[in-house]
């Protein structure tokens, strides 16, 4: 058993049929010695008396808010949550496996630049009685500070018969060094509590590996005289690290016909313009990627050819 | 470059960008076997990293690029020695189309651009490598190339910025 926060405790249980469970001793936070009784949740049934209460925690029915009283007055509470371990593996019932970029990916994180700011998100089908708490650091043995905000519900989607809820959190490294080569990864830890179930999820990454620039901005077409060609131009996204002579992007320009089956013409360039042939009913799209490190491409910025 | 003269920024920029491309193309082609995360000991912890105080940020380069260039040179020599070690020259043999050989030569080429014959910076950090067991090598190669990708990305940014802003 360990303390998650004040008056909230997590009991770690091996979860299998007829498991013996864990013996837990609760102590009432009071100077009083006599006349103390214990109850669980809203029940008025007295579970025991005395300053300490010893219970055998085997299942969710044994978890909940234990309260010690004296003469009708509440002295203190202890909330017991369960953390299940099945076949040596901690349960992951609360969050959905996003399966990207690999199986058992529950947390996904992205950064728009090298400033040390990043966003993580996760999915669940649970809509109520759900709380999250997020901590982060750079490295684990001698951790350096990363400050995370509160996790918030950022999207709701309908997937077949189910509703899916996306939560996200923003974090900022306290002393970021955008130009340095990271040697210690960022660690992100999410505590999830659903009713009386506790789970924790972790992710470890370098900012460089989660970079995904915003799409190029101000995408424009300029027809070239007496030609089917156009000059496409764009600019670095505002959110990208500066100076651009140091934090350089590379770009992919794509001409795509109306039909998805039509052949796509693609051009790669380090410049912020390119000359392409604009077909009727086609659209021109441009996306960006770090020039020197193959992290994710941005989403496409698009304009119609006409 | 030792002694304070300027490097050939544009040549360094071109070669460092080529190094980035090679490091990424070499990464999946490090051997004939499936990579298993056997023996996941931290073996690449001792590689030289370009750290915050090394002056490789735009301001540091403007103030005095020598600190940064020396750090990059140390890293290039270190990785060049790693790529020539039995981790890469021993079994499992590299795939026939592996660009590790080209990568190795380019690391040497860039380090020579930074330190021409007869000029010397202080003693380099040399990899202390006991011969690795063959079964460890795929994972070691994988980790070394991952680490090299990060190192050459910073070096390429330095040379690109230098070519754009510090070239005579």
């Amino acid at each position: 058993i360990w303390e998650l926060k004040k008056d909230v405790y997590v009991v770690e249980l091996d979860w299998y049929p007829d498991a013996p469970g864990e013996m837990v001793v609760l102590t009432c936070d009071t100077p009083e010695e006599d006349g103390i009784t214990w109850t669980l949740d809203q029940s008025s049934e007295v579970l025991g008396s005395g300053k300490t209460l010893t219970i055998q925690v085997k299942e969710f029915g044994d978890a909940g808010q234990y309260t010690c009283h004296k003469g009708g007055e509440v002295l203190s509470h202890s909330l017991l949550l369960l953390h299940k371990k099945e076949d040596g593996i901690w349960s992951t019932d609360i969050l959905k496996d996003q399966k990207e970029p690999k199986n058992k990916t529950f947390l996904r994180c992205e950064a728009k630049n090298y400033s040390g700011r990043f966003t993580c998100w996760w999915l669940t089908t649970i809509s109520t009685d759900l709380t999250f708490s997020v901590k982060s650091s750079r490295g684990s043995s001698d951790p350096q500070g990363v400050t995370c905000g509160a996790a918030t519900l950022s999207a709701e989607r309908v997937r077949g018969d189910n509703k899916e809820y996306e939560y996200s959190v923003e974090c900022q490294e306290d002393s970021a060094c955008p130009a340095a080569e990271e040697s210690l990864p960022i660690e992100v830890m999410v505590d999830a509590v659903h009713k009386l179930k506790y789970e924790n999820y972790t992710s470890s990454f370098f900012i460089r590996d989660i970079i995904k620039p915003d799409p190029p901005k101000n995408l424009q077409l300029k027809p070239l005289k007496n030609s089917r060609q156009v000059e496409v131009s764009w600019e670095y996204p505002d959110t990208w690290s500066t100076p651009h002579s140091y934090f350089s992007l590379t770009f992919c320009v794509q001409v795509q016909g109306k039909s998805k089956r039509e052949k796509k013409d693609r051009v790669f360039t380090d410049k912020t313009s390119a000359t392409v042939i604009c077909r009727k009913n086609a659209s021109i799209s441009v996306r960006a990627q770090d020039r020197y490190y193959s992290s994710s491409w941005s989403e496409w910025a698009s304009v119609p050819c006409s | 470059v030792p002694g304070g003269s300027s490097p050939a920024w544009t040549q360094c920029q071109q070669l460092s960008q080529k190094l980035c491309t090679l490091a990424w193309s070499a990464h999946p082609l490090v051997g004939h076997m499936d990579l298993r995360e056997e023996g996941d000991e931290e073996t690449t912890n001792d590689v030289p990293h370009i750290q915050c105080g090394d002056g490789c940020d735009p301001q540091g380069l403007r103030d005095n690029s020598q600190f940064c260039l020396q750090r990059i040179h140390q890293g290039l020599i270190f990785y060049e020695k790693l790529l020539g070690s039995d981790i890469f020259t021993g079994e499992p043999s590299l795939l026939p189309d592996s660009p590790v050989g080209q990568l190795h030569a380019s690391l040497l080429g860039l380090s020579q651009l930074l330190q021409p014959e007869g000029h010397h910076w202080e003693t380099q950090q040399i990899p202390s490598l006991s011969p690795s067991q063959p079964w460890q090598r795929l994972l070691l190669r994988f980790k070394i190339l991952r680490s090299l990708q990060a190192f050459v990305a910073v070096a390429a940014r330095v040379f690109a910025h230098g070519a754009a802003t510090l070239s005579p």
Partner: antibody, heavy 115, light 107 residues
């Protein structure tokens, strides 16, 4: 085409030393280790060790430490093995090979130790 | 050191037979096992690497299987030119060790 050309047969007296060579061609000499393997007449194969011509790093089978010394000369793309304090037990064919998971072996050097 | 044990020591076969040669390692070597063929007065020739990977120029009748500590070299239709001694080799850890060989002869 990759080739490993070994030096010719040697007849040596007990207690003497012998140095044999393995000249590599058709590839970058420093890009691969070179192993040495012993085979006594009518018997199996025994791994002696390898040299990495890039940095002259060596790895020996404990059994051959003090018996075999591996060296290389990058200028001539040649690997060498010297065997010292020879006895009749050292009479064998010695092969050089470029990585044991590749199909490149020298033709072997026969060493005969005889008074 | 890892000990490689080959069986049988000798195998007499008829051309066209399918044969299996066995090799056992004294501890797990994953798939780090190579097979060689050596004909009389010739250098060894690599047949199979990493337990099952084929080698360019080696006839397709030769195949390998196994992982951990038990390995098999199969020749699915023996030809008269397949006579010789077949060795397996531990390529997992130093010192590299070879099996004592299986001699294949034609009846």
């Amino acid at each position: 085409e990759v080739q490993l050309q070994q030096s010719g047969p040697e007849v040596v007296k007990p207690g003497a030393s012998v140095k044999m060579s393995c000249k590599a061609s058709g590839y970058t000499f420093t890009s691969s280790v070179i192993h040495w393997v012993k085979q006594k007449a009518g018997q199996g194969l025994e791994w002696i060790g390898y040299i990495n011509p890039y940095n002259d790093g060596t790895k020996y089978n404990e059994k051959f430490k003090g018996k075999a010394t591996l060296t290389s000369d990058r200028s001539s793309s040649t690997a060498y093995m010297e065997l010292s304090s020879l006895t009749s037990e050292d009479s064998a064919v010695y092969y050089c090979t470029r990585r044991l998971d590749e199909a490149y072996w020298g033709q072997g050097t026969l060493v005969t130790v005889s008074a | 050191d890892i000990v490689m044990t080959q069986s049988p020591a000798t195998l007499s076969v008829t051309p066209g037979d399918r044969v299996s040669l066995s090799c056992r390692a004294s501890q797990s070597i994953s798939e780090y096992l190579h097979w060689y063929q050596q004909k009389s007065h010739e250098s060894p020739r690599l047949l199979i690497k990493y337990a099952s990977q084929s080698i360019s120029g080696i006839p397709s009748r030769f195949s390998g299987s196994g992982s951990g500590s038990d390995f098999t070299l199969s020749i699915n239709s023996v030809e008269p030119e397949d006579v010789g001694v077949y060795y397996c080799q531990n390529g997992h850890s130093f010192p590299f060790t070879f099996g004592s060989g299986t001699k294949l002869e034609i009846k």
